[in-house]
């Protein structure tokens, strides 16, 4: 018979014949032959493979390094990787949560638009005209300038995105 050019699902083509893939949690030891089945072996402790595969080495479980602010959210199995997350008060530094850092602060002139969570950093926004922030903070929003008029005062010094206005008494003409 003609050798196959394509194989069924969960099979792979090698040496002009279709061999069974190894199931999740197992690695390939030897390809099948005309007379023998594919030989697979279970992944060792702290290893995994999450798909039907022909890998000769299992993948290492991710290590949730406490020195990087990480802790185990879900322990790995022979078929799944360990899932890490950040300690309280820290957030992931990337999509795969490879490590964690303390939440970013918004510099003076910027306010917090969105407070950080375990998976996302602080989002800062520039203080618009009429608002200011004079501190570096991970939770403070931009504050509105003081309204001198409501205090029956006048603006003596204009505000900026980093400083509040300075109010002073109105100059009154003497009789």
């Amino acid at each position: 018979p003609e050798p196959p050019t394509a194989c069924r699902e969960k099979q792979y083509l090698i040496n002009s014949q279709c061999c069974s893939l190894c199931q999740p949690g197992q690695k390939l030891v030897s390809d099948c032959t005309e007379f023998t089945e594919t030989e697979c072996l279970p992944c060792g402790e702290s290893e995994f493979l999450d798909t039907w595969n022909r890998e000769t080495h299992c993948h290492q479980h991710k290590y949730c390094d406490p020195n990087l602010g990480l802790r185990v959210q879900q322990k790995g199995t022979s078929e799944t990787d360990t899932i890490c997350t950040c300690e309280e008060g820290w957030h992931c530094t990337s999509e795969a949560c490879e490590s964690c850092v303390l939440h970013r602060s918004c510099s003076p002139g910027f306010g917090v638009k969105q407070i950080a969570t375990g998976v996302s950093d602080t989002i800062c926004e520039p203080c618009p005209v009429g608002f200011f922030s004079n501190v570096s903070s991970a939770f403070e929003k931009c504050h509105p300038w003081t309204s001198c008029e409501t205090k029956d005062l006048v603006v003596q010094q204009a505000g900026t995105n980093k400083t509040d206005v300075v109010c002073g008494p109105q100059d009154r003409l003497r009789a």
Epitope: K62, T93, A96
Partner: antibody, heavy 115, light 112 residues
């Protein structure tokens, strides 16, 4: 063994697309971010972009219009495509595991842009 | 992108010297900063991340400090194998549309 290996043509013509592949072993691409970095001869490191463990892509502002990073988890490969290349794109191109904490690097591959 | 300004660009020193390299970020990146060592013809090697945490197998003469926008790498007593180029790298990440990343320009540590 945990390792990375870049591969691709060492010579690319101006205005063509540079295509590189990074083949990984010993860890799962779905669990790590992968970055591409380049280094022009005699110069410093330049971040090109990254692909997250969940598939999100992140590009340096200079690269946004020209770069595509993709991943094929079944082949354990991450690819980089850089279009409309010029002589200024001549560099050693590295793939690395991670985002800021780049704890594992390939040996790098030199790509020369020349006609 | 995040701009990281490294200084000095070049540094001549002798074995046993204490060496300090600084890295300034254009915006607050918390402690999300790494330091790398690179030797000619080789890929960079991770020394420190985040900011002050030594990577596995890195000698204790290396130390890092700083947070926010100002960071420092110190080699307490320079050894012959430490003559190399050092890079800082840092950034932040919130989502695909809100992130920053970059490398410093490098500091070449040469033999005096």
């Amino acid at each position: 063994e945990v390792q990375l290996q870049e591969s691709g043509p060492g010579l690319v013509k101006p205005s063509d697309t540079l295509s590189l592949t990074c083949t990984v072993s010993g860890f799962s691409l779905s669990s790590y971010d992968m970055s591409w970095i380049r280094q022009p001869p005699g110069k410093g490191l330049e971040w090109i972009g990254a692909i997250g463990g969940a598939g999100g892509t992140y590009y340096a502002s200079w690269a946004k219009s020209r770069v595509t990073i993709s991943v094929d988890t079944s082949l354990n490969q991450v690819s980089l495509k850089l279009s409309s290349v010029t002589a200024a794109d001549t560099a050693v191109y590295y793939c690395a595991r991670g985002w800021t904490r780049l704890d594992l690097w390939g040996q790098g591959t030199l790509v020369t842009v020349s006609s | 992108d995040i701009q990281l300004t490294q200084s000095p660009s070049f540094l001549s020193a002798s074995v046993g010297d204490r060496v300090t390299i600084t890295c300034q970020a254009s915006e607050d990146i918390s402690s999300n900063l790494a330091w790398y060592q690179q030797k000619p013809g080789k890929p960079p090697k991770l020394l420190i991340f985040p900011a002050s945490n030594l990577a596995s197998g890195v000698p204790s003469r290396f130390s890092g400090s700083g947070s926010g926008t100002e960071f420092t790498l110190t080699i307490s007593s320079l050894q012959p194998e430490d003559f190399a180029t050092y890079y800082c790298q840092g950034g932040y990440w919130t989502s695909t549309s809100n992130f920053g990343q970059g490398f410093g320009g490098g500091t070449k540590v040469e033999i005096k």
